[in-house]
Amino acid sequence: PPNRRTCVFFEAPGVRGSTKTLGELLDTGTELPRAIRCLYSRCCFGIWNLTQDRAQVEMQGCRDSDEPGCESLHCDPSPRAHPSPGSTLFTCSCGTDFCNANYSHLPPPGSPGTPGSQGPQAAPGESIWMAL
């Protein structure tokens, strides 16, 4: 039988807005990944920032509802925004426990689906918060 969906929870310092209220944090101790049990969906998400071939996690947690993409078993990120020149935000949604822990692969930033220069921008050093 299914359990309530459990996702990895992480929010990088400086990230604006929190998704902590979308679930209940489990007490996992210090050495394990933080885990959140989703309150309103059976869907996890992840956001990574790719800069000069280096990916850094920005946010991981629960989505606020089940949307297209949530049926995916794995985290397959797609490019969503350019928060600053030379960096691209990739996001994924997936619907299995801890599926947002890491991604299967990142497509190249210039691949189809990347928003053009009209995408969300952020000043250098400023983080961006995206409504998923």
Epitope: P1, P2, N3, R4, R5, T6, L26, T28, L32, P33, A35, C38, L39, Y40, S41, R42, D66, D97, F98, A101
Partner: antibody, heavy 113, light 112 residues
Framework: QVQLVQSGAEVKKPGASVKVSCKAS????????VSWVRQAPGQGLEWMGE????????NFNEKFKGRVTMTTDTSTSTAYMELRSLRSDDTAVYYC??????WGQGTLVTVSS | DVVMTQSPLSLPVTLGQPASISCRSS???????????LEWYLQRPGQSPRLLIY???NRFSGVPDRFIGSGSGTDFTLKISRVEAEDVGVYYC?????????FGAGTKLEIK
């Protein structure tokens, strides 16, 4: 087919610890939570907690916090439940289950001085 | 903790006749994701519990279709359309919506 095979019966003294093992086969061990449930003699079932073998994240019944440790060894597809500071009312059959759908045969733990 | 109240505690049934077990929870078991984490188990004498129903009404694989789960919110029912000899044992309802997960006290089904 899915199978969960538990370790044999144990007799312990009050204050001691017990570690029950649960060896899984027939499925991908890291893809399912392992639940632990106990049943005192002639009584009903009591949920103790669960662990996700892929990363070791566990979720406990507060009643057992501080006394129970759940671990897994993914190389042998084995889950473990250790209960410390045993009391006579911990005498029970301890069951492991694959996310509550397939259950082990149970391990009787008797706590007696 | 969420209290699961089963009735009756003992259920004598004639072979071939229907049987019904009620389970009431002290809080709604519908979770924020829209799913109701309510399950039914049968523990035959001397055996481990066996999953019958999950998500209120979904039969687990291999469970005969004479077992029917229904209900919502705080009121749930397990019906057996025609009781067979192998159905003897203790039936437990269980909720996984709230922590800690909790079982009902059990309903002992026996043949008259």
């Amino acid at each position: 087919q899915v199978q969960l095979v538990q370790s044999g019966a144990e007799v312990k003294k009050p204050g001691a610890s017990v570690k029950v093992s649960c060896k899984a086969s027939g499925y991908t061990f890291t893809d399912y939570w392992v639940s632990w449930v106990r049943q005192a003699p002639g009584q009903g079932l009591e949920w103790m907690g669960e662990i996700y073998p892929k990363n070791g994240v566990s979720n406990f019944n507060e009643k057992f916090k501080g006394r129970v440790t759940m671990t897994t060894d993914t190389s042998t597809s084995t889950a473990y439940m250790e209960l410390r500071s045993l009391r006579s009312d911990d005498t029970a059959v301890y069951y492991c289950a694959r996310q509550r759908d397939y259950w082990g045969q149970g391990t009787l733990v008797t706590v007696s001085s | 903790d969420v209290v699961m109240t089963q009735s009756p505690l003992s259920l004598p049934v004639t072979l071939g006749q229907p049987a019904s077990i009620s389970c009431r929870s002290s809080q709604s078991l519908e979770y924020g994701d829209g799913y109701t984490y309510l399950e039914w188990y049968l523990q035959r004498p001397g055996q481990s519990p066996r999953l019958l129903i999950y998500g209120v009404s979904n039969r687990f694989s291999g469970v005969p279709d004479r077992f029917i789960g229904s209900g919502s919110g705080t009121d749930f029912t397990l019906k057996i359309s025609r009781v067979e000899a192998e159905d003897v044992g203790v039936y437990y309802c269980f909720q996984a919506t709230h922590d800690p997960n909790t079982f009902g006290a059990g309903t002992k089904l026996e043949i008259k």
